[in-house]
Interface confidence: low
């Protein structure tokens, strides 16, 4: 049976397609190609006479068609209008006609897409953002990636418009990622450049550091306020309700008990229209011990069994208004998950003790004008002999 085959079936615009013929009869007078599913003289592309080897263009010929002696038809520089059915009519020597119909589909070569947005600076927990993949194209699949990964499953993400539009509802700061869209059809694919979403958020409840609330007379007060916010917030301070400078850091040299009171940090984000604040009480002691006495370390035990026992080391001092630091082999502690400080750093707990914890420990007490170290204490770590295997 006479058949035709398109090579390829899906063709990129501007490329060429070959309509191959299979099972061509032996004794032939000639053949003719038509656009469409039937023989129609008005839609003849080309006729070919075997005897004269003469090709005659028909009304539907565009000048891009070439017919071969084996009846195959080559169409070059195809356009989307070329999509559809093609019918071959074979005229045998007995002038009996035989027909076969084939088809192919022309797809456009896709351009590099781009992403447009209805909101380039959305506000967290307030705005939605719709990304649209441009351009709009027929018979095209639209794909999206976030940070190089396919879209996560989330009720806040919605694809619409044939997946051409990606909507993020109730955006959060975690949505500030790189978004890429891709387009593909049967013959080509392309990706957009990444677009990073700039989510406006905050200001969150600020944090004042350092966390200390008690200070000694003569010390410098250096308070820093930080709030997560995009863009960075405006900072201002109030002491006992009285406005101070509009800076992130509040510095007062050589404080006295007159500086006791409430210290409030205010943050505002003009872009989100939101504000936040935090209040901290500061107490300044009247007297400052000029010299810190030498502290002592007390240990719950100094010889322990590794991987089994725990140990508590306590730094004893009679001084007030001091801070405490711990050291082990010249390294500041804690240095591992197993080490915990408590009671304002007075107690160092190690649970469980391991071989690498063996060695000398000491503590240091200090205030703004002096410091002193304890004598070191030696911690010994033993391991019970393992039982012999049979």
């Amino acid at each position: 049976q006479l058949t035709t085959e398109s090579m390829p079936f899906n063709v990129a615009e501007g490329k060429e397609v070959l309509l191959l013929v299979h099972n061509l009869p032996q004794q032939l007078f000639g053949y003719s190609w038509y656009k469409g599913e039937r023989v129609d003289g008005n839609r003849q592309i080309v006729g070919y006479a075997i005897g004269t080897q003469q090709a005659t263009p028909g009304p539907a010929n565009s000048g891009r068609e070439t017919i071969y002696p084996n009846a195959s038809l080559l169409i070059q520089n195809v356009t989307q209008n070329d999509t559809g059915f093609y019918t071959l009519q074979v005229i045998k020597s007995d002038l009996v006609n035989e027909e076969a119909t084939g088809q192919f589909h022309v797809y456009p070569e896709l351009p590099k897409p781009s992403i447009s947005s209805n909101n380039s600076k959305p506000v967290e927990d307030k705005d939605a953002v719709a990304f649209t993949c441009e351009p709009e194209a027929q018979n095209t699949t639209y794909l999206w990636w976030v940070n190089g990964q396919s879209l996560p499953v989330s009720p806040r993400l919605q694809l619409s418009n044939g997946n051409r539009t990606l909507t993020l509802f109730n955006v959060t700061r975690n949505d500030a990622r790189a978004y890429v869209c891709g387009i593909q059809n049967s013959v080509s694919a392309n990706r957009s450049d990444p677009v990073t979403l700039d989510v406006l958020y905050g200001p969150d409840t600020p944090i004042i550091s350092p966390p200390d609330s008690s200070y000694l007379s003569g010390a410098n007060l250096n308070l820093s306020c930080h709030s997560a916010s995009n863009p960075s917030p405006q900072y201002s301070w109030r002491i006992n309700g009285i406005p101070q400078q509009h800076t992130q850091v509040l510095f007062i040299a050589k404080i006295t008990p007159n500086n006791n009171g409430t210290y409030a940090c205010f943050v505002s984000n003009l872009a989100t229209g939101r504000n936040n604040s935090i209040v901290k009480s500061i107490t300044v002691s009247a007297s400052l011990s000029p010299v810190v006495a030498k502290p002592q370390i007390k240990a719950s035990k100094t010889t322990v069994t590794g991987d089994k026992d725990s140990v508590n080391l306590t730094c004893s001092t009679n001084d007030t208004g001091i801070s405490i630091r711990w050291f082990f082999k010249n390294q500041s502690l804690p240095s591992s998950e197993r080490m915990k400080l408590s009671q304002g750093n007075i107690t160092l707990s190690i649970n469980p003790v391991k071989r690498e914890d063996a060695g000398t420990y000491w503590c240091e007490v200090f205030n703004p004008i002096s410091k002193n170290q304890s004598d070191p204490i030696m911690l010994n770590v033993n391991y019970n002999a393992l039982p012999q295997e049979n």
């Epitope: 190089g148 990444p194 990073t196 700039d198």
Partner: antibody
Framework: QVQLVQSGAEVKKPGSSVKVSCKAS????????MHWVRQAPGQGLEWMGR????????KYVPKFQGRVTITADTSTSTAYMELSSLRSEDTAVYYC??????????????WGQGTLVTVSS | EIVLTQSPATLSLSPGERATLSCRAG??????????LHWYQQKPGQAPRLLIY???NRATGIPARFSGSGSGTDFTLTISSLEPEDFAVYYC?????????FGQGTKLEIK
Amino acid sequence: QVQLVQSGAEVKKPGSSVKVSCKASGFNIKDTYMHWVRQAPGQGLEWMGRIDPANGNSKYVPKFQGRVTITADTSTSTAYMELSSLRSEDTAVYYCAPFGYYVSDYAMAYWGQGTLVTVSS
Amino acid sequence: EIVLTQSPATLSLSPGERATLSCRAGESVDIFGVGFLHWYQQKPGQAPRLLIYRASNRATGIPARFSGSGSGTDFTLTISSLEPEDFAVYYCQQTNEDPYTFGQGTKLEIK
């Protein structure tokens, strides 16, 4: 921390090929594009192309199309740039640089130390 | 491709002075109003070093005397008070679209 270590200097004959490697550490190269930039003696910086190590897709400047091949081996976190049909004007220092959201916020924050390729007969 | 033109080609200044370097793009390098334009510093025998990314963001470890501004097609790198180590070649680069072109460079030299 991010580190990029490139292969050593090369001296090549005109018409031959050179393959420069760039081993990355401190980040996952699948999360970035790996770019190659060259600089001829006394000249400015010239972007050559890039690869997406996650899928092997590469893109080249038309000037180098057909002569340059950029590849990546994610198992060893190494990117490669091969330049063929070398000519004297290819004498340059070749740099690799990761580029992407995770590592460099869409700029070239980190660079390899550079590989000098000298083309001379 | 997007052509970047830097000016001046050479800038002769003394330590302590203010330096203003310009980079002009042949077409906008903005994405959603943010310029994908970056500044690099390069000293002889060294790889380039990122100073400013996306027009105005200082890269990690870059001193506050370096600042960037601009959007669309016109961008500026400013060094408020030159230090001796700032004398080098400065390049701008756009990553808005392929190919990711560089400017031809501005050489900042000691007067």
